[in-house]
């Protein structure tokens, strides 16, 4: 039945069958000899969704994913046998699981896979224009995939390709122990995080990587990595996970005498996403699962949306927290974490911080150091032993904007769309879960824009069998959502206005920013349309005010809906 917009109960709950019957989902159920449709690359210009999977790369039409091209990229029988002899599973491990799929230039993609525990990369030709209809593997040009793709398909990789250079957070060894953030490709020697030092990285699980400008000077550009890792000894009693944001200067070329071919500007900080718990002890959501950057107006200051779960076996829950880049930068300009030895507590470093401040990008702006290779020895020495910041980054409003603790699922993915409505702009979140459902949630500002009320609009099952959602992309051009899992790929529209009913009141009560009552139906709201008779109230969901005007159907009868 109809539900008003309470946080815990969706306005609409649609089963997979109902989604199919109402033409609200298109599913690609995978190939018999493939799986793991986890690596997505959205190309709005070409209207394609590229998907890396087991032994295959797909190019789906954004209009309808039933229309696709595929590249088969398996490993040789010899390589597969070697993998099997090393004691690996022939089906789940001894194949080429695509982990990296990035735009390389106007005509090519760059792809890397696990290569049956022997990482390998190549280029994919996609042509200059969509009408070229080219999608083929450059068979003559294979490259070593170490430091780009992990050996083990179970391991996560975060990557970013900019200006011909690939930044990857991955494991660089066969056993998945040597985790690092690498920069490869390009004309320079590869650069990486310090080896064998748990203060830098401590068994990390990489989530994503993003380029964010600091100023109008491109020399100040930074690459930010989001990951979770084991808390460093002394940082926490017992074994714990911490969510992290790490920074690296794009123009970091390593040190001259120390930290040679290692990052000199790497810093990391903890991301906090917690709620006050009983006994004054906060309940932390530390297992960062996904990150989405909402770029709006100012690309230097995107809003960071993070999806977190709890690591506790007793208490299972998920949350979404929002962070501002100004808060992140403030932490990176704050005190460094320091301790005098393994048995000491971590404290804020109180001593003299060398100049230029470690973590600052070399540029004419600050200090006149043209390259990290010119940095003074004391800066490098300090940077090597102080990679972590003491203060954590707290979320906006100091609390999550979405919390789910009373359900049999956990959040896995998030994408966000900024929607223009009659009464302002709203961020609509699409949250993927580990049981193959997508939650559509709108955040509604209350007194201040960052003090938000969450309304759960829809809960949609997008795969036939419960399967964890592992990838999501949103096309604003097509107004479609694309979802990946082990089983396949699904496509669904961002809005289903007609499903909200045949009455103005129901359309209004839905509080869906995409939808408004147009006098005869609940339909997609376009702010540019000059129709006076558009009833919509996202902020309050009040049909009495909006559905009683002349010319607007004001019936308040509630129809039975999909539940």
């Amino acid at each position: 039945n109809y539900q008003n917009g309470k946080n815990n109960v969706p306005r609409l709950k649609l089963s997979y069958k109902e989604m199919l019957e109402s033409n609200n989902v298109i599913t690609f159920n995978g190939l018999a000899n493939s799986s793991s449709y986890h690596t997505f690359l959205l190309d709005e210009e070409r209207s394609r969704l590229y998907v890396g999977a087991k032994d295959h790369i797909f190019s789906f039409d954004l209009v309808n994913i039933k229309d696709f091209q595929k590249i088969v990229w398996p490993v040789s029988y010899t390589r597969r046998d070697e993998c099997k002899w090393a004691g690996k599973d022939i089906l789940k491990e001894c194949a080429n699981f695509i982990k990296v799929l990035k735009a390389y230039n106007q005509t090519h993609l760059y792809a890397c896979g696990t290569g049956a525990f022997h990482p390998i990369c190549t280029y994919i030709e996609i042509g200059h224009h969509p009408e070229d209809n080219i999608f083929k593997l450059e068979n003559s040009h294979f490259e070593n995939g170490r430091g780009k793709s992990p050996y083990d398909p179970k391991l996560l990789t975060a990557s970013l390709l900019i200006d011909g250079e690939l930044y990857s957070g991955t494991a660089a060894d066969f056993m998945g122990r040597d985790f690092a953030i690498f920069r490869t490709l390009g004309h320079h020697h590869p650069i990486r995080t310090e080896q064998h030092d748990s203060r830098w990285l401590n068994d990390p699980k990489f989530i994503s990587a993003h380029l964010i400008s600091e100023s109008d000077n491109p020399e100040d550009d930074k690459v930010y990595f989001f990951f979770r890792e084991n808390a460093i000894d002394g940082e926490h009693s017992g074994k714990a996970t911490h969510a992290r944001i790490g920074q690296i200067c794009k123009n970091d070329f390593g040190g001259h005498r120390s930290l040679v071919n290692k990052w000199t500007t790497f810093l990391k900080a903890r991301l906090i996403c917690s709620v006050p718990g009983p006994n004054g002890i906060d309940t932390h959501f530390d297992e960062l699962q996904d990150v989405f950057l909402m770029n709006f107006k100012d690309p230097k200051n995107p809003v960071v949306y993070g999806v977190f779960t709890t690591s506790s076996n007793i208490f299972k829950g998920s949350a979404v927290c929002m962070y501002s880049m100004s808060d992140v930068r403030r932490v990176f300009l704050g005190p460094y974490a320091h301790r005098d030895g393994p048995n000491y507590q971590w404290v804020p470093y109180q001593g003299r911080v060398p100049y230029p401040r470690p973590g600052t990008c070399p540029s004419k702006t600050f200090g006149g150091f043209d390259s990290t290779k010119d940095l003074p020895d004391d800066v490098i020495t300090f940077a090597r032993s102080h990679p972590a910041m003491y203060n954590p980054v707290f979320p906006m409003n100091n609390r999550p904007i979405v919390i789910k603790t009373d359900v049999n699922y956990q959040f896995t993915q998030i994408v966000v769309d900024r929607v223009d409505a009659e009464d302002g702009q709203y961020d609509v979140m699409f949250i993927g879960t580990d049981v193959g459902t997508v939650l559509k949630v709108v955040s509604i500002p209350k007194e201040t824009w960052y003090d938000l009320e969450e309304v759960l609009l829809e809960e949609m099952t997008v795969f036939r069998e419960p399967t964890a959602i592992s990838a999501m992309e949103l096309s604003t051009k097509q107004q479609q959502l694309y979802i990946g899992s082990t089983a396949g790929v699904a496509q669904l529209p961002l809005h289903r206005c007609d499903i909200y009913g045949k009455a103005c009141a129901e359309c209004c009560l839905a509080r869906d920013p995409y939808c408004a009552w147009d006098g005869s139906a609940c339909s997609r709201y376009f702010p540019t349309a000059k129709a006076r008779t558009r009833a919509q109230d996202i902020r309050n969901g009040d049909p009495l005010t909006h559905c009683s005007d002349g010319g607007i159907e004001g019936r308040m009868d509630h129809h039975h809906h999909h539940h």
Epitope: C83, A86, H118, R146, D178, H189, Q195, R199, S258
Partner: antibody, heavy 123, light 112 residues
Framework: EVQLLESGGGLVQPGGSLRLSCAAS????????MNWVRQAPGKGLEWVSG????????DYADSVKGRFTISRDNSKNTLYLQMNSLRAEDTAVYYC????????????????WGQGTLVTVSS | QSVLTQPPSVSGAPGQRVTISCTGS?????????VHWYQQLPGTAPKLLIY???NRPSGVPDRFSGSKSGTSASLAITGLQAEDEADYYC???????????FGGGTKLTVLG
């Protein structure tokens, strides 16, 4: 000029102990990972142990695990190998070697070696 | 027993070209780990000859070259000279029990 000078070798009885030292000069000792590699008379090279610049990572070959301890003192530019419960098969020339990590993939290459010190385990 | 396999000996006349092979497995050379080569002249400590499969440290003549393919690597010496007579060792990284592994060594004899 990079120099590594081992000392502390000698004759010791089975079950005995010995402590080897390696004095480093000509480079920033505290920036490099260091290793011990041994060579039994007339035989090939065998990696024994490695230690990172800040002693955060330490590892040993299976053949010496639990008996040998690697350590370093960056203030003295010195690498050590404490060898306990020595056996006849530990007889070898012990070399101190610096990890260069010169290659693209940071797989340890030993770019500088000491001249070695002979350890003989015999009754 | 060494993890990497090298021929015990090779020989060649001055001016000739010789190659030394080094065969590993899918968890060392075959897993993408780099191969390095060392030269040990009689009575001296080993010296790094080739690093990262094919790179020469400064001071090493260009008569020495290295290559790698699949699970094996090789060292080639052209224009053989009497002073090249030495033991040559390959090394790589063992991925399953992570540590450095060496080949058994190859004795190069320069004939005549």
């Amino acid at each position: 000029e990079v120099q590594l000078l081992e000392s502390g070798g000698g004759l010791v009885q089975p079950g005995g102990s010995l402590r080897l030292s390696c004095a480093a000069s000509g480079f920033d000792f505290d920036s490099y990972e260091m290793n011990w590699v041994r060579q039994a008379p007339g035989k090939g090279l065998e990696w024994v142990s490695g230690i990172s610049w800040n002693s955060g990572w330490i590892d040993y070959a299976d053949s010496v695990k639990g008996r040998f301890t690697i350590s370093r003192d960056n203030s003295k530019n010195t690498l050590y190998l404490q060898m306990n419960s020595l056996r006849a098969e530990d007889t070898a020339v012990y070399y101190c070697a610096r990890s260069g990590y010169s290659s693209s993939w940071f797989d340890p290459d030993f770019d500088y070696w000491g001249q070695g010190t002979l350890v003989t385990v015999s009754s | 027993q060494s993890v990497l396999t090298q021929p015990p000996s090779v020989s060649g006349a001055p001016g000739q070209r010789v190659t030394i092979s080094c065969t590993g497995s899918s968890s060392d050379i075959g897993a993408g780990y780099d191969v390095h080569w060392y030269q040990q002249l009689p009575g001296t400590a080993p010296k790094l000859l080739i690093y990262g499969n094919s790179n020469r440290p400064s001071g090493v003549p260009d008569r020495f070259s290295g290559s790698k393919s699949g699970t094996s690597a090789s060292l080639a010496i052209t224009g053989l000279q009497a002073e090249d007579e030495a033991d040559y060792y390959c090394s790589s990284y063992e991925g399953i029990n992570p540590y450095v592994v060496f080949g058994g060594g190859t004795k190069l004899t320069v004939l005549g």
